[in-house]
């Protein structure tokens, strides 16, 4: 048994069929010795008397808000929550698994850039009686500080007959160095409660994997005279990491033409220019990627070519 | 919102067997604990059985080796199969759904059905 918070307790149980479960004592927050009786959530069943009390934990029927009381004054309470083992593998039901990049991805995670800011999320079939709060830093030995603001609820989409939800957290690292080569990784930690239930999650990462630039800002065309080519220009999105001349990205750009089943014309380039053929009804298409390492492509920015 | 229909309940002697069955519609089905408690008069309801979404099997002594919970996701029901029945097991059968297991508590579940009677004659 370990204290997640003040007053909050998580019991460890590695459950089977017939399991006898862990034995638990709570002690009574009191300097009172005598006439202290027990009571388990709003029941007013008598579980035991004296300062201690020592439960078998052997279902999440035991589980809940045990009370301390003496001549109908409450002294102290502690909710037990269960982190349940089963076959050797801790329960993982209250996150869905994302299964990308691969199976058991419950924490996935972007940057938008090398400041050391990272926006990780998770998605879940549950509405209610959900807590979660998030935890990370560089390293694990010695760790190094990362702040995390509250997880909160960013997106509802239906799925067939559920609602699924997500929830989003923004963390920073403390003291990020932009152009420093990483050598440990970030972890990031959640605690997750769901009722009675407790699970934990985690991810580590290096920021230079999931970084993922917002896509080409003030993407335009130019038509070039007695020509059916255009040039296209755009920017370095907003939020790219500065200055750009060592931050460099490089740009994919894309003619698409109305059906999906046309041919797609591709060019590469490292400039932040192009020239191509517009095609009627196609549309141009612009993605960046870092330049010195093969991590995520932003998503698209398009113009239309009429 | 999940809705659990019971049905299979009757007039049995002791000693033989039934089957019970609950229907369960509305949000996916695999996603939920499923329980099955029963209530005879004037009594608290009592836990029988649960399964879990991974067909994990929880029981109390009252009623192990002699009752089986099983589930078919595929059919979005799950079935409690009664043998070597007795008078004392004559109650109103109820189908929960939840998201603890294991769990004996009824209020651990948040779904419940209307209700099957079963009754043990001897």
């Known amino acids: 048994i370990w204290e997640l918070k003040k007053d909050v307790y998580v019991v460890e149980l590695d459950w089977y069929p017939d399991a006898p479960g862990e034995m638990v004592v709570l002690t009574c927050d009191t300097p009172e010795e005598d006439g202290i009786t027990w009571t388990l959530d709003q029941s007013s069943e008598v579980l035991g008397s004296g300062k201690t009390l020592t439960i078998q934990v052997k279902e999440f029927g035991d589980a809940g808000q045990y009370t301390c009381h003496k001549g109908g004054e409450v002294l102290s309470h502690s909710l037990l929550l269960l982190h349940k083992k089963e076959d050797g593998i801790w329960s993982t039901d209250i996150l869905k698994d994302q299964k990308e990049p691969k199976n058991k991805t419950f924490l996935r995670c972007e940057a938008k850039n090398y400041s050391g800011r990272f926006t990780c999320w998770w998605l879940t079939t549950i509405s209610t009686d959900l807590t979660f709060s998030v935890k990370s830093s560089r390293g694990s030995s010695d760790p190094q500080g990362v702040t995390c603001g509250a997880a909160t609820l960013s997106a509802e989409r239906v799925r067939g007959d559920n609602k699924e939800y997500e929830y989003s957290v923004e963390c920073q690292e403390d003291s990020a160095c932009p152009a420093a080569e990483e050598s440990l990784p970030i972890e990031v930690m959640v605690d997750a409660v769901h009722k009675l239930k407790y699970e934990n999650y985690t991810s580590s990462f290096f920021i230079r994997d999931i970084i993922k630039p917002d896509p080409p800002k003030n993407l335009q065309l130019k038509p070039l005279k007695n020509s059916r080519q255009v040039e296209v220009s755009w920017e370095y999105p907003d939020t790219w990491s500065t200055p750009h001349s060592y931050f460099s990205l490089t740009f994919c750009v894309q003619v698409q033409g109305k059906s999906k089943r046309e041919k797609k014309d591709r060019v590469f380039t490292d400039k932040t220019s192009a020239t191509v053929i517009c095609r009627k009804n196609a549309s141009i298409s612009v993605r960046a990627q870092d330049r010195y390492y093969s991590s995520s492509w932003s998503e698209w920015a398009s113009v239309p070519c009429s | 919102e999940v809705q659990l229909v019971e049905s299979g309940g009757g007039v049995v002697q002791a000693g033989e067997s039934l089957r019970l069955s609950c229907a369960a519609s509305?949000?996916?089905?695999?996603?939920?604990?499923m329980g099955w408690f029963r209530q005879a008069p004037g009594t608290e309801r009592e836990f029988v059985a649960s399964?879990?979404?991974?067909?994990?099997?929880y029981y109390p002594d009252s009623v192990k080796g002699r009752f089986t919970i099983s589930r078919d996701n595929a059919k979005n029901t799950v079935y409690l199969q009664m043998s070597s029945l007795k008078p004392d097991d004559t109650a109103v059968y109820y189908c929960?759904?939840?998201?603890?297991?294991?769990?004996?508590?009824?209020?651990?579940?948040?779904?419940w059905g209307q209700g099957t009677q079963v009754t043990v004659s001897s």
């Open positions: 509305g949000r996916t089905f695999s996603n939920y604990e």
């Open positions: 399964i879990s979404r991974r067909y994990s099997t």
């Open positions: 929960a759904a939840g998201q603890l297991f294991p769990s004996s508590r009824s209020r651990d579940y948040d779904y």
